[in-house]
C-alpha cells in the first residue's frame, strides 16, 4: 500500500503520500483551534504509471491509454485513499470543546 | 455537479467531466472486442480551487492551504466521481459473449 | 480460473542476458493486456513491460535492452533481457488482466551480480 509506513521510508518517485504539516494560524489563517497549533495533515503526489496502484478498471483503461499515447493530457491522478480524523480543542465563549474533524490526516493514496 | 450535463455544455476551466473517446484497436492495442469499436471514456480535467467541488474536509483544508501558499506542489486533483459500465461483445471460440465492465465511463468529476 | 508460472530466473553477471517465461492456463479470453512486473526489496510492484494485442509498451529504465513477446495460440509471454544491470535484481512476476481482473504468477528471482 501506498501509506506513511512506506512511503515516508522511501525514496519513491511516483504516487506515494508526502510529509506536509500545516498550521492553522499560519497556512490557514484559522485563530479559532486552541489545541494543536498545526498538524501533519500530509499529501498525495507523483505520478501514476501504468499501473501503479491504480484504482478502479477505468483508471486502468486510461493508464493504458496513456503508455500508448503519452502526450495525452489524461491521466490518473495521485490522490488521497485513507483519511483519518484529527481531534481539536475549541473554545465557545470560555467553555473549550472537543471535537473531531473527519477526514483530515492523509494516511494512504492511490492513482485515481 | 461537475457531470457531463453541465460539463459539456460550458467552458469551465475548474475541474470537470472532458470528453474522450478511446478506440480500442488504436489506442489500446485491443483486438478482442467486437461491438463497440471505442467508447466515450471521458477524463477529468481542470485545476480545483477554493472550493470548487471538493470531495472531503481534507480537500477543503488542502485547496485553503493552496489559497495561501500558491507556490505549494500540495494540491487537491480532479478526478472521477461518477462512473458507469460499459457493455461489450467479444467472442470465446465462436461463441458470441456480452460482458458488462464496470467503471469504465466518467460521468462526473471532483476535486480530491 | 487462470493461472500463471514463470521460469528463467537466476544469477548471472552484469552485461549478461536471460530470457524469462510465462505459461498461463485456464480458460483464457477478454485479455487486457499481459506483462512482466518487478518487484525490488522493500520496493513497490514496477511495471516493466506490457503487451496487448497488437502493442507494446516498456518502463523508461529497460528500453532498447528488454523484448516483451506473446505466442497466443501457445498462452505463453517471454521476456529476453540483455545488457543486464545490478539494479534489475529483483523478483520477476508475469501479470495477465482478463476483463479488468489481474491474475500473478508467483514470480523468479533475477539477480544480477559481479
Known amino acids: 500500500a501506498l501509506d506513511t509506513n512506506y512511503c515516508f521510508s522511501s525514496t519513491e518517485k511516483n504516487c506515494c503520500v508526502r510529509q506536509l504539516y500545516i498550521d492553522f494560524r499560519k497556512d490557514l489563517g484559522w485563530k479559532w483551534i486552541h489545541e494543536p497549533k498545526g498538524y501533519h495533515a500530509n499529501f498525495c503526489l507523483g505520478p501514476c504509471p501504468y499501473i501503479w496502484s491504480l484504482d478502479t478498471q477505468y483508471s486502468k483503461v486510461l493508464a493504458l491509454y496513456n503508455q500508448h499515447n503519452p502526450g495525452a493530457s489524461a491521466a490518473p491522478c495521485c490522490v488521497p485513499q485513507a483519511l483519518e480524523p484529527l481531534p481539536i480543542v475549541y473554545y465557545v465563549g470560555r467553555k473549550p470543546k472537543v471535537e473531531q474533524l473527519s477526514n483530515m490526516i492523509v494516511r494512504s493514496c492511490k492513482c485515481s | 455537479a461537475l457531470d457531463t450535463n453541465y460539463c459539456f455544455s460550458s467552458t469551465e476551466k475548474n475541474c470537470c467531466v472532458r470528453q474522450l473517446y478511446i478506440d480500442f484497436r488504436k489506442d489500446l492495442g485491443w483486438k478482442w472486442i467486437h461491438e463497440p469499436k471505442g467508447y466515450h471514456a471521458n477524463f477529468c480535467l481542470g485545476p480545483c480551487p477554493y472550493i470548487w467541488s471538493l470531495d472531503t474536509q481534507y480537500s477543503k483544508v488542502l485547496a485553503l492551504y493552496n489559497q495561501h501558499n500558491p507556490g505549494a506542489s500540495a494540491a487537491p486533483c480532479c478526478v472521477p466521481q461518477a462512473l458507469e459500465p460499459l457493455p461489450i461483445v467479444y467472442y470465446v471460440g465462436r461463441k458470441p459473449k456480452v460482458e458488462q465492465l464496470s467503471n469504465m465511463i466518467v460521468r462526473s468529476c471532483k476535486c480530491s | 480460473q487462470v493461472q500463471l508460472v514463470e521460469s528463467g530466473g537466476g544469477l548471472v553477471q552484469p552485461g549478461e542476458s536471460l530470457r524469462l517465461s510465462c505459461t498461463a492456463s485456464?480458460?483464457?479470453?477478454?485479455?487486457?493486456?499481459m506483462g512482466w512486473f518487478r518487484q525490488a526489496p522493500g520496493k513497490q510492484r514496477d511495471m516493466v513491460a506490457i503487451?496487448?494485442?497488437?502493442?507494446?509498451s516498456y518502463a523508461d529504465s529497460v528500453k532498447g535492452r528488454f523484448t516483451i513477446s506473446r505466442d497466443n495460440a501457445k498462452n505463453t509471454l517471454a521476456l529476453q533481457m540483455n545488457s543486464l544491470k545490478p539494479e534489475d535484481t529483483a523478483v520477476y512476476f508475469c501479470?495477465?488482466?482478463?476483463?479488468?481482473?489481474?491474475?500473478w504468477g508467483p514470480g523468479t528471482q533475477v539477480t544480477v551480480s559481479s
Open positions: 501479470n495477465l488482466n482478463q476483463l479488468g481482473t489481474d491474475y
Open positions: 485456464g480458460s483464457i479470453f477478454g485479455v487486457f493486456y
Open positions: 503487451s496487448t494485442d497488437d502493442r507494446t
